[in-house]
């Protein structure tokens, strides 16, 4: 249940458009887990690329790029009757407002590729 | 290049811990694309579960849960020599500060499952 049942939801139209945000992250170390090697062991493996932007918070985001057009079979060969596709997620980041140097930001949506999965084409069409 | 080259990076230790954030999202409709059906067509299919929390912004986040332990083969059977695993990503959300109803939040890290991928087990051991 909400801690403040009388508070308007932050997505309501009547909610203040500018809010104060504390950058001391909660759960900083919660959920920390050893780096997964799924990107190598997947049938739709991917590479991870560093996307850096000093005007953004967080300034570094890692993006996945599928290695193959098809998927890797049990023998290590690429099967082009299947597709390696990026799994994408919309995330929120903070973008520094250009006119206010130190402490003014704006929420921004980013579409990031988190990893890849192997899917069956709807239309099987190979030249 | 940074819009404000003299500005400290928001991740620097000397950066103000409390900042102003405009909730009018930039890129609200950017990258909007037709809803993907990969969750059904994947060899490691998943279901999407709604995670709702009125004290969080965004209040609704969709979480993926892999349907199978193994992966679906070309004939539609589950192959238990492979594993369906969740692809997870750490995201930032805004958590309402309990003592300040209207416009005070704190950044919080969340680990969310975005989708599933099919991986080769490290140890092939089936009872």
């Amino acid at each position: 249940s909400p801690q403040n049942p009388g508070c308007p939801n932050a997505e309501d139209k009547n909610f203040p458009r500018t809010v104060m945000v504390n950058l001391n992250i909660r759960n900083r170390n919660t959920n920390s887990k050893r780096a997964s090697d799924y990107y190598n062991r997947s049938s739709s493996p991917w590479n991870l690329h560093r996307n850096e932007d000093p005007e953004r918070y967080p300034s570094v985001i890692w993006e996945a790029k599928c290695r193959h057009l098809g998927c890797v079979d049990a023998d290590g060969n690429v099967d082009y009757h299947m597709n390696s596709v990026p799994i994408q997620q919309e995330i929120l980041v903070l973008r520094r407002e250009p006119r206010h140097c130190t402490n003014s930001f704006r929420l921004e949506k980013m579409l990031v590729s988190v990893g890849c999965t192997c899917v069956t084409p709807i239309v099987r069409h190979v030249a | 290049s940074p819009q404000n080259p003299g500005c400290p990076n928001a991740e620097d230790k000397n950066f103000p811990r409390t900042v102003m954030v405009n909730l009018n999202i930039r890129n609200r409709n950017t990258n909007s694309k037709r809803a993907s059906d990969y969750y059904n067509r994947s060899s490691s299919p998943w279901n999407l579960h709604r995670n709702e929390d009125p004290e969080r912004y965004p209040s609704v986040i969709w979480e993926a849960k892999c349907r199978h332990l193994g992966c679906v083969d070309a004939d539609g059977n589950v192959d238990y020599h492979m594993n369906s695993v969740p692809i997870q990503q750490e995201i930032l959300v805004l958590r309402r500060e309990p003592r300040h109803c209207t416009n005070s939040f704190r950044l919080e890290k969340m680990l969310v499952s975005v989708g599933c991928t099919c991986v080769t087990p490290i140890v092939r051991h089936v009872a």
Epitope: H68, L69, V123 | -
Partner: nanobody, 125 residues
């Protein structure tokens, strides 16, 4: 949104070589697998080659395999098609395209949403 502009097409003798370039504008260029297609006069547009998002994997149609090479340089936002041992039947307008959907396999033309205006390649005998 991605805009694609091809260049490098010209008249060349049979047996010669060409390198086509496809320059992309738009920050999301690196998010897409890319492909080259071609259309000869009076014929349908057909698949030539494709390259994965990371550039690690490529695929070709049978009639160019071993003669053409597709590559990408994400730092320059450019995709290339290096064509060797050209034949008169390679004469066509060559189009670069970005694959944004995965309803079919890599050569399925409807999966490519963004297209350039094309560059003319003419191979004389």
């Amino acid at each position: 949104e991605v805009q694609l502009v091809e260049s490098g097409g010209r008249l060349v003798q049979a047996g010669g070589s060409l390198r086509l370039s496809c320059a992309a504008s738009g920050r999301t260029f690196t998010s897409y697998p890319m492909g080259w297609f071609r259309q000869a006069p009076g014929k349908e547009r057909e698949f030539v080659a494709a390259i994965s998002m990371s550039g690690d994997d490529t695929a070709y149609t049978d009639f160019v395999r071993g003669r053409f090479t597709i590559s990408r340089d994400d730092a320059r936002n450019t995709v290339y098609l290096h064509m060797t041992s050209l034949k008169p039947e390679d004469t066509a307008v060559y189009y670069c395209a970005a694959r944004t959907s995965y309803d079919g396999t890599y050569d399925y033309i409807d999966d490519y949403s963004y297209w350039g205006q094309g560059t003319q390649v003419t191979v004389s005998s």
